[in-house]
């Protein structure tokens, strides 16, 4: 399956925080989305192979890495002034 953690996270002003996403499905592609209240999902970043990733529609204030196939952590940087949202990680073949 796919595991995202933590379930809840509080960020102090000026801090970077990292959300973990791990999958054991042997999927090549992984995605991070953000959902704000009353809105649909918006793509932040996606990765289609190890060590390669592309910006989605709202990448500013976020960073990612894809050091291994199973993992695609998302860092919410201090430059992201409005980080409060629901974050969803997904993967696909």
């Amino acid at each position: 399956g796919i595991t995202q953690s933590p379930k809840y996270l509080f960020r102090k002003e000026g801090q970077n925080v990292t959300l973990s996403c791990e999958q054991n499905l042997n999927h090549d592609a992984m995605y991070w989305y953000r959902q704000d209240p009353g809105q649909g999902l918006r793509l932040i970043y996606y990765s289609q192979i190890v060590n390669d990733f592309q910006k989605g529609d709202i990448a500013e204030g976020y960073s990612v890495s894809r050091e291994k196939k199973e993992s695609f952590p998302l860092t919410v940087t201090s430059a992201q002034k409005n980080p409060t949202a629901f974050y969803l990680c997904a993967s696909s073949i």
């Epitope: 090549d28 592609a29 289609q48 192979i49 190890v50 060590n51 390669d52 990733f53 592309q54 890495s65 894809r66 050091e67 291994k68 196939k69 993992s71």
Partner: antibody, heavy 120, light 112 residues
């Protein structure tokens, strides 16, 4: 900052096995990425030989497949190249290399290179 | 294997010149994921190659803006808009779309 350093004999006799080791500092080879061997012939042509992945799996150049083995020693954070049945055509500068984050498979961390001469 | 053919093999130019090096692959370098893994390296004598451009047109960290990459499919170009003295070196294209990864034969850029 990832740093790589090759070590091994500079002279190998024909028909013997070439053995080189790459020591990695600044990053654990089990944490991610692909750990490559690339060689450069005296005429300056570059050849990708193969890699060992963070999970220990391999991908080799088919032109070398019957002769090449890339292995690792995770306790020493090293990966190694063995090339059997060498001939003078294997004389080259051998580099270990790994990709730079976010570039696909484009490598930008390189060892300094070690010259291997195959001669009796 | 994918053959990578660079032209010219050598080139003489002067400081301030605009220089273009081309690289042609024997097959399309578009990956099944729609990305194109074509890269350019610079190598100086006695040193390891250095990454200049990755994925056709992305300048690597610290690479001056006078270097640019373009192209698609099988035909690619590295352009140096205004040659500087430190740019005289050998340039290689490389593909990592298909295994085995392969390199062009190199283009040696010399001072005229």
């Amino acid at each position: 900052q990832v740093q790589l350093q090759e070590s091994g004999p500079g002279l190998v006799k024909p028909s013997e096995t070439l053995s080189l080791t790459c020591t990695v500092s600044g990053y654990s080879i089990t944490s991610g990425y692909f750990w490559n061997w690339i060689r450069q012939f005296p005429g300056k042509g570059l050849e990708w030989m193969g890699y060992i992945s963070y999970d220990g799996s391999n991908n080799y150049n088919p032109s070398l497949k019957s002769r090449i083995t890339i292995s690792r020693d995770t306790s020493k954070n090293q990966f190694s190249l063995k090339l059997s049945s060498v001939t003078a055509a294997d004389t080259a500068v051998y580099y270990c290399a790994s990709p730079s984050p976010g570039t696909g498979y484009a490598v930008d961390y390189w060892g300094q290179g070690t010259t291997v001469t195959v001669s009796s | 294997d994918i053959q990578m053919t660079q032209s010219p093999s050598s080139l003489s130019a002067s400081v301030g010149d605009r220089v273009t090096i081309t690289c042609r692959s024997s097959q399309s370098l578009v990956h099944s994921n729609k990305n194109t893994y074509l890269h350019w390296y610079q190598q100086k004598p006695g040193k390891a190659p250095k990454l200049l451009i990755y994925k056709v047109s992305n300048r690597f960290s610290g690479v001056p803006s006078r270097f640019s990459g373009s192209g698609s499919g099988t035909d690619f170009t590295l352009t140096i808009s205004s040659l500087q003295p430190e740019d005289f070196a050998t340039y290689y294209c490389s593909q990592s779309t298909h295994v085995p990864f392969t390199f062009g034969q190199g283009t040696k850029l010399e001072i005229k």
